[in-house]
Interface confidence: low
Amino acid sequence: EEELQVIQPDKSVLVAAGETATLRCTATSLIPVGPIQWFRGAGPGRELIYNQKEGHFPRVTTVSDLTKRNNMDFSIRIGNITPADAGTYYCVKFRKGSPDDVEFKSGAGTELSVRAKPSAPVVSGPAARATPQHTVSFTCESHGFSPRDITLKWFKNGNELSDFQTNVDPVGESVSYSIHSTAKVVLTREDVHSQVICEVAHVTLQGDPLRGTANLSETIRVPPTLEVTQQPVRAENQVNVTCQVRKFYPQRLQLTWLENGNVSRTETASTVTENKDGTYNWMSWLLVNVSAHRDDVKLTCQVEHDGQPAVSKSHDLKVSAHPKEQGSNTAAENTGSNERNIY
């Protein structure tokens, strides 16, 4: 009679995490008598997965009834597969011996590949806000997927980005993998409503990629532009001066009026108007009693935005001229104005 062969017909078995793997094995003969054992890996460090003779293997069930005398099907099912179960499984026939059974013949092995979905990508931006024209970095991370092949793309408002670096770890063989990508994004003044999206495609996702997003509103700081103007006279000895604070983001802003360098009033932006690009406008006004001043007055609108160094804009108010004659010719009134922008 021909010598027993152990046949593992499947070179590889692909299973999604959480599912059941079927590992097929048949013997060509009932002789010699002895049990079958399943191992993961080969050599001295191999791991026992199932022993027909003895032991408790709660995740393993046999496909056929091994207690039947004529059974030659030693296929097993392993339930609730995780990436840690990946490896090559060997069906090994033992010959009955005394005191111990002796390994007789092994199958060629079946490679179990576990397909595990990547976790939802998590996108994180810089710790501190940055201003337009600056380049900021965003990171995207996803974990726990297998096999290693994965595709990651970055988008800003639907447009694919090209300036990014991606690493999949570990480099060598592993039960599961992680991906880490860093993208560089140049901010513009219009980015308050912008989104950065990290998209991960993997064979387990059946063509429906996972996405992680970050809102640039949490990253960008748009510094305000200031304009100080003198309004038409309201009363014989009063001048109304306004400070228009335009296109800033976020809303956190404090404004201080200075008269000849002395603090006149401080207020916090409250009733702001929102522009369609997401930035804000705000206006503050100061009523100056001209009769209280003998000399020209230097009015300064000083704005501290989002904890940054103050930005200021000044306006020279000529006391010598009659208020009614000053009108609202801001170009003339701003002559000699001092603009100092600190970002």
């Epitope: 017909p9 499947d10 070179k11 590889s12 078995v13 692909l14 299973v15 079927t22 097929r24 090559t88 060629a108 092995g109 079946t110 490679e111 397909r115 096999p147 290693r148 092949d149 063989e173 064979v203 059946q206 063509g207």
Partner: antibody, heavy 132, light 103 residues
Framework: AVTLDESGGGLQTPGGALSLVCKAS????????MGWVRQAPDKGLEFVAG???????????TYGAAVQGRATISRDNGQSTVRLQLNNLGAEDTGIYFC??????????????????????WGHGTEVIVSS | AVTQPASVSANPGETVKITCSGS???YGWYRQKSPGSAPVTLI????KRPSGIPSRFSGSKSGSTNTLTITGVQADDEAVYYC??????????FGAGTTLTVL
Amino acid sequence: AVTLDESGGGLQTPGGALSLVCKASGFTFSSYNMGWVRQAPDKGLEFVAGIYTGSDAGLSTTYGAAVQGRATISRDNGQSTVRLQLNNLGAEDTGIYFCTKSAGGCSDYNCDAYIADSIDAWGHGTEVIVSS
Amino acid sequence: AVTQPASVSANPGETVKITCSGSSSYYGWYRQKSPGSAPVTLIYDNDKRPSGIPSRFSGSKSGSTNTLTITGVQADDEAVYYCGNEDNSYVGIFGAGTTLTVL
């Protein structure tokens, strides 16, 4: 008898595209993995592409590093043909292209054969020359 | 990567062994008599012989090394012998080839 007949070779223009067809006969085509292997002048064998029988998306096609992104392999089980399309040709694509049959195939969840380790039949080859 | 010796030589009637090492579980052996001619499969899946291949060609695997054994080498066996396998992404890999010279 198993026969694999390649066609579509010849002189090709750099930057252009080629389409090779392998007509198979003598076996149940749909049950077997198929592939393309090439040999540049005075060089060894190089795996180009493989196509599997199973519908499993992760293992339906594979490509060698030199042609990844430029090559498309497809099969028509009704016509018993396997096609290789290669774009953006360069001088390094010059060589003889062999159609191969594997000893087995894949189902959705298992394989009893791959490509380069399981070839049991080769075509005679079709020569491709990329030159201006 | 697949590693095989660049050349081996043997006298007629001797036994020659050509080794191929890599990380795969399965290997095939292919013979090419002249460059550009169609290769012939000697062994696939480690130890299987296609019909028509003489039994003096055999394949075996031990660990990560696969061996093609040719017993009773003949002058007609002069050729380049390639081993092939698959990497972890199922992409085929061929060795650089071993030239067998029959002395």
